[in-house]
Interface confidence: medium
């Protein structure tokens, strides 16, 4: 079971999945950088079926998406949450 904590504590991902999620199933991705109470980099994926998944930041597929988003954001105005 994948868990995301929503508490006064700042780290939200207990477990992370490296399982590929097709882009058509992804609603949005939130990247929480290290710091601000959680020393861990966390990537949280909101799926279109309303489920929430913490993704292993080292997973190759999410790194490819992140790289694509970085390239996209460098050519367009930045948005707060992808």
């Amino acid at each position: 079971v994948l868990e995301v904590y929503y508490t006064h504590l700042r780290c939200r991902c207990v477990q992370e999945s490296s399982v590929f999620i097709p882009r058509r199933f992804i609603d949005r991705i939130q990247i929480s950088p290290r710091g601000n109470g959680c020393p861990r980099k966390e990537i949280i994926v909101w799926k279109k079926n309303k489920s929430v998944v913490c993704v292993d930041p080292q997973a190759e597929w999410i790194q490819r998406i992140m790289e694509m988003l970085r390239k996209k954001s460098s050519s367009t105005p930045p948005v707060p949450v992808f």
Epitope: E3, V14, Q15, E16, G35, G37, P39, D56, Q58
Partner: antibody, heavy 119, light 107 residues
Framework: EVQLLESGGGLVQPGGSLRLSCAAS????????MSWVRQAPGKGLEWVSA????????YYADSVKGRFTISRDNSKNTLYLQMNSLRAEDTAVYYC????????????WGQGTLVTVSS | DTQMTQSPSTLSASVGDRVTITCRAS??????LAWYQQKPGKAPKLLIY???SLASGVPSRFSGSGSGTEFTLTISSLQPDDFATYYC?????????FGGGTKLEIK
């Protein structure tokens, strides 16, 4: 009751290798971030490494990066620390710790295992 | 890396005393600070996290305060069981770092 039991410590020569194990019980191991913290004789505490519940994310202190590897086997409820290229300054008691949920703080500690690096 | 500095390194006190230990961070860490107690030959024990939140089972005579770069651990009335070494630790960012420790000894 949360229990963490380290093993695998001992005397090793400089440049040698050692693998520490930590057997966990009393909680859902696969849902817990785990860490290793060490303490040289008569000295203070030093954080060594941390690993996520799934094992996908790992972090290391600069002093051990490239030499130590943290891993886990959730089917065996066991945490590991593979230590290579050991140096005299790695001599310490190594503690296995379980983080509190959602916070990078060691809420539970094992009793420790002593690693001595000496020729 | 965030450096943590504790003072004093040694503190002599008597049973019933009120004692305060200080921990300073080299950069702002908000309130992401924990305190541990360690007795000789034993593993450390978590006392306080988030600067002032008491860990489960910790007596109320222990309290923590502070934010940013300066933090304190206070023991309102020392008990014989409290003579130990105390460490602060920041968890704002990896690498997690500890203070050098404060040894609380009997006067």
């Amino acid at each position: 009751e949360v229990q963490l039991l380290e093993s695998g410590g001992g005397l090793v020569q400089p440049g040698g290798s050692l693998r520490l194990s930590c057997a966990a019980s009393g909680f859902t191991f696969g849902n817990s971030w785990m860490s290793w913290v060490r303490q040289a004789p008569g000295k203070g505490l030093e954080w060594v490494s941390a690993i996520s519940g799934s094992g996908g994310s790992t972090y290391y202190a600069d002093s051990v990066k490239g030499r130590f590897t943290i891993s886990r086997d959730n089917s065996k409820n066991t945490l590991y620390l593979q230590m290579n290229s050991l140096r005299a300054e790695d001599t310490a008691v190594y503690y296995c710790t379980r983080d509190l949920p959602g916070i990078a703080v060691a809420g539970y500690w094992g009793q420790g295992t002593l690693v001595t690096v000496s020729s | 890396d965030t450096q943590m500095t504790q003072s004093p390194s040694t503190l002599s006190a008597s049973v019933g005393d009120r004692v305060t230990i200080t921990c300073r961070a080299s950069e702002g860490i908000y309130h992401w600070l924990a305190w541990y107690q360690q007795k000789p030959g034993k593993a450390p024990k978590l006392l306080i996290y988030k600067a002032s939140s008491l860990a489960s089972g910790v007596p109320s005579r222990f309290s923590g305060s502070g934010s940013g770069t300066e933090f304190t651990l206070t023991i309102s009335s020392l008990q014989p069981d409290d003579f130990a070494t105390y460490y602060c630790q920041q968890y704002s960012n990896y690498p997690l770092t500890f203070g050098g420790g404060t040894k609380l000894e009997i006067k």
